[in-house]
Amino acid sequence: PTSSWNISSELNKDSYLTLDEPMNNITTSLGQTAELHCKVSGNPPPTIRWFKNDAPVVQEPRRLSFRSTIYGSRLRIRNLDTTDTGYFQCVATNGKEVVSSTGVLF
C-alpha cells in the first residue's frame, strides 16, 4: 500500500495542463475556410472538446470537423457562411485540471 501511494503521488506531481497560446479571433469571407487552433499541452495528454456559443460543436461531413494535432486540436470550417459567426471555445482537461480558450469567428 505504501509503495502504490508513492507512485500515485509521483504521477500527481508530474501532471500538468497548460494553455500554450490563447485562441485568436478570426475574420474571414463567405465561402472561405477558417481554422481555429487550440494550443494546449499536458500530462496525461488532455482531452479537448469544442463549443460554439456555449454548445457542443456539431460536426458536418466535408464542411466542419475537428481533430487532434501535435499542439492540441484544430477546428476547420469550410465554405463559411454568415451563420457560422459566433464564439468558439476549446476546453481541455487532463482529468484533474481544466483550461479553456475562446475566439470569435466573424
Epitope: A55, V58, T83, G86, Q89
Partner: antibody, heavy 119, light 107 residues
Framework: EVQLVESGGGLVQPGGSLRLSCAAS????????IHWVRQAPGKGLEWVAA????????YYADSVKGRFTISADTSKNTAYLQMNSLRAEDTAVYYC????????????WGQGTLVTVSS | DIQMTQSPSSLSASVGDRVTITCRAS??????VAWYQQKPGKAPKLLIY???SLYSGVPSRFSGSRSGTDFTLTISSLQPEDFATYYC?????????FGQGTKVEIK
C-alpha cells in the same frame, strides 16, 4: 448592473428616417454582440441587425439590408440603428439586446422603443 | 434558413397546472436553445439557456430539456405571474431564430 436603454422612437412618414440609440452600461461594451430585435404589434420577435462594437462587424436581416445601418460608438458605449426609407411594415417596438459572454442567448434586453411608420 | 417550429400557439391552463411547450429545430442546433418569457408591453426575459440551464433568478418551476432537435419548456406548477407569451430561440446558427411564440392564458 448591466443596463440597455433605447431611445429615438417615434412617428415617421413612409420613406422617412429615424435613428435609434441603445445606451449600454455595466459591462465591457466592445466585447459583446449587440443586436436589434423588433416586434410588430401583436406579432412575434424578429431579428433586425447586429454589431460587434470592438471590430465594427455588422450583420443585417434581408428585410432591412440596404435601408438600415447599425453602428456603435465605443467611447459612448452606445449602439445605433439608422433607419432610412421606412415602410409601414417597419412599425414595431425595437429592442436592443446583448448576446451573452459566450454567445449564450440574449441575456439582457432594453425596455424597447416604439417606431410607427404612418402617413 | 433554420426554422424553429413552436407549438402550441396558445393554450389555456389553470394555476397549479403542469404546462409543456415544445420547439422543433429544422436542423441540428446542438444544445444552443433558449426560452424567453414576455409579458404585454415588456421586453422578453431569459428563462432557460443551453436547452436546460436555468438562468439566474428564474424560479425552479421552469425547466428545459432536449431530445435531438426537439426542445421542451416545462412549468411544473403554473403560477398567476406565469401567464405570458413564451418564445424559444436557437442561437447556434448566427444570428439566431425565434419560434412563433406560445401564449399561455388563464382557463
Amino acid at each position: 448592473e448591466v443596463q440597455l436603454v433605447e431611445s429615438g422612437g417615434g412617428l415617421v412618414q413612409p420613406g422617412g428616417s429615424l435613428r435609434l440609440s441603445c445606451a449600454a452600461s455595466g459591462f465591457t461594451f466592445g466585447s459583446y454582440f449587440i443586436h436589434w430585435v423588433r416586434q410588430a404589434p401583436g406579432k412575434g420577435l424578429e431579428w433586425v441587425a447586429a454589431i460587434f462594437p470592438a471590430g465594427g462587424y455588422t450583420y443585417y436581416a434581408d428585410s432591412v439590408k440596404g435601408r438600415f445601418t447599425i453602428s456603435a460608438d465605443t467611447s459612448k458605449n452606445t449602439a445605433y440603428l439608422q433607419m432610412n426609407s421606412l415602410r409601414a411594415e417597419d412599425t414595431a417596438v425595437y429592442y436592443c439586446a446583448r448576446y451573452g459572454s459566450m454567445g449564450g442567448a440574449f441575456d439582457y434586453w432594453g425596455q424597447g422603443t416604439l417606431v410607427t411608420v404612418s402617413s | 434558413d433554420i426554422q424553429m417550429t413552436q407549438s402550441p400557439s396558445s393554450l389555456s391552463a389553470s394555476v397549479g397546472d403542469r404546462v409543456t411547450i415544445t420547439c422543433r429545430a429544422s436542423q441540428s442546433v446542438s444544445s444552443a436553445v433558449a426560452w424567453y418569457q414576455q409579458k404585454p408591453g415588456k421586453a422578453p426575459k431569459l428563462l432557460i439557456y443551453s436547452a436546460s440551464s436555468l438562468y439566474s433568478g428564474v424560479p425552479s418551476r421552469f425547466s428545459g430539456s432536449r431530445s435531438g432537435t426537439d426542445f421542451t419548456l416545462t412549468i411544473s406548477s403554473l403560477q398567476p405571474e406565469d401567464f405570458a407569451t413564451y418564445y424559444c430561440q436557437q442561437y447556434y446558427w448566427f444570428p439566431g431564430t425565434f419560434g412563433q411564440g406560445t401564449k399561455v392564458e388563464i382557463k
